[in-house]
Amino acid sequence: SEVEYRAEVGQNAYLPCFYTPAAPGNLVPVCWGKGACPVFECGNVVLRTDERDVNYWTSRYWLNGDFRKGDVSLTIENVTLADSGIYCCRIQIPGIMNDEKFNLKLVIKPAKVTPAPTRQRDFTAAFPRMLTTRGHGPAETQTLGSLPDINLTQISTLANELRDSRLANDLRDSGATIR
């Protein structure tokens, strides 16, 4: 079953996906599509990378992470309720049926207009399923870049850890505490 991620209307959504290039600069094509991963390729492609860069994208979809080191996590800008659904991250490893496929479920909640303290309580209540809607700049990508090599079976664990660490950053930045 797919892992669930959440965001509010009007915010940016973040869907994690990672792989480790076999060697520096030896990138693998990746596609992101709306809808569960089919047998081949991605359906309803929203973004695609090749051996060097992002070579196709549609409005509001982009890679904010260090995709040349394997962080191909998708950012969806200014989400609406229509963005809810399953997204496929497909790492197109050369060879027959070698692709790694990840289905991620994005749940969009209506925006809440509430004072700051309530918003901080929401952060805590959503833990650990809260989706960060704010990146933390170059330091974050440098940290990712220095992670030890991982294999594809570890991606799901890494995604969960990253999501939780991003939440921790958001909680810290908002003044909330983690218990």
Partner: antibody
Framework: QVQLVQSGAEVKKPGASVKVSCKAS????????MDWVRQAPGQGLEWLGY????????SYNQKFKGRVTMTTDKSTSTAYMELRSLRSDDTAVYYC?????????????WGQGTTVTVSS | SIVMTQTPKFLPVSAGDRVTMTCKAS??????VAWYQQKPGQSPKLLIY???NRYTGVPDRFTGSGSGTDFTFTISSVQVEDLAVYFC?????????FGTGTKLEIK
């Protein structure tokens, strides 16, 4: 040390072709992309395309597709850029530039430039 | 293709000044922006890569920052040898595009 040495200046007539060479030394030629960038007189920089010597893969700026071809000779560590059907607005300095993984494919070394003048 | 809008076109400076120039991408390019310096009759030189990383041997008075669509390049204390044209470039997606350049000139 890393060096990219380009061929000399060329004067061509409209409709002709030009082939510029870029000889690399001081690094493993096949490990880095070679991009080509041009600069018209008093103007900014414009990307023409790249070639990856290791696999021979190329990517060209759509604006030049059908007119530009990039090749390499691995035995001499030389990259070539050929531009066909030249027009007067192709008059520019043409640079080869090394795109490396560790600089995120920005250009850490540039050739000295080759001036191509297209004039009747 | 992604348009890189660079401002200002000209920047009058005196030695010791702190100067800042900006580049705005027409769509998000993550951190995939480089800054180059070009002096008359010379090839461009890489100063900053991946938005904020100083290239080897580049003095620490040169700094870059930003991500997404807005990028800034700063020289903390301009030296005479810094008089040149500075270009930003996105290398997120081909065709890779450059800003139109900012020329540093004496006040």
């Amino acid at each position: 040390q890393v060096q990219l040495v380009q061929s000399g200046a060329e004067v061509k007539k409209p409709g002709a072709s030009v082939k510029v060479s870029c000889k690399a030394s001081g690094y493993t030629f096949t490990d880095y992309y070679m991009d080509w960038v041009r600069q018209a007189p008093g103007q900014g920089l414009e990307w023409l395309g790249y070639i990856y010597p290791n696999k021979g893969g190329t990517s060209y700026n759509q604006k030049f597709k059908g007119r530009v071809t990039m090749t390499t000779d691995k035995s001499t560590s030389t990259a070539y850029m050929e531009l066909r059907s030249l027009r007067s607005d192709d008059t520019a300095v043409y640079y080869c530039a090394r795109g490396g993984y560790y600089s995120y494919y920005s250009y850490d070394y540039w050739g000295q430039g080759t001036t191509v003048t297209v004039s009747s | 293709s992604i348009v890189m809008t660079q401002t200002p076109k000209f920047l009058p400076v005196s030695a010791g000044d702190r100067v800042t120039m900006t580049c705005k991408a027409s769509q998000s390019v993550g951190n995939n922006v480089a800054w180059y310096q070009q002096k008359p009759g010379q090839s461009p030189k890489l100063l900053i890569y991946y938005a904020s990383n100083r290239y080897t041997g580049v003095p620490d008075r040169f700094t870059g920052s930003g991500s997404g669509t807005d990028f800034t390049f700063t020289i903390s204390s301009v030296q005479v040898e810094d008089l040149a044209v500075y270009f930003c470039q996105q290398h997120y997606s081909s065709p890779y595009t450059f800003g139109t350049g900012t020329k540093l000139e004496i006040k």
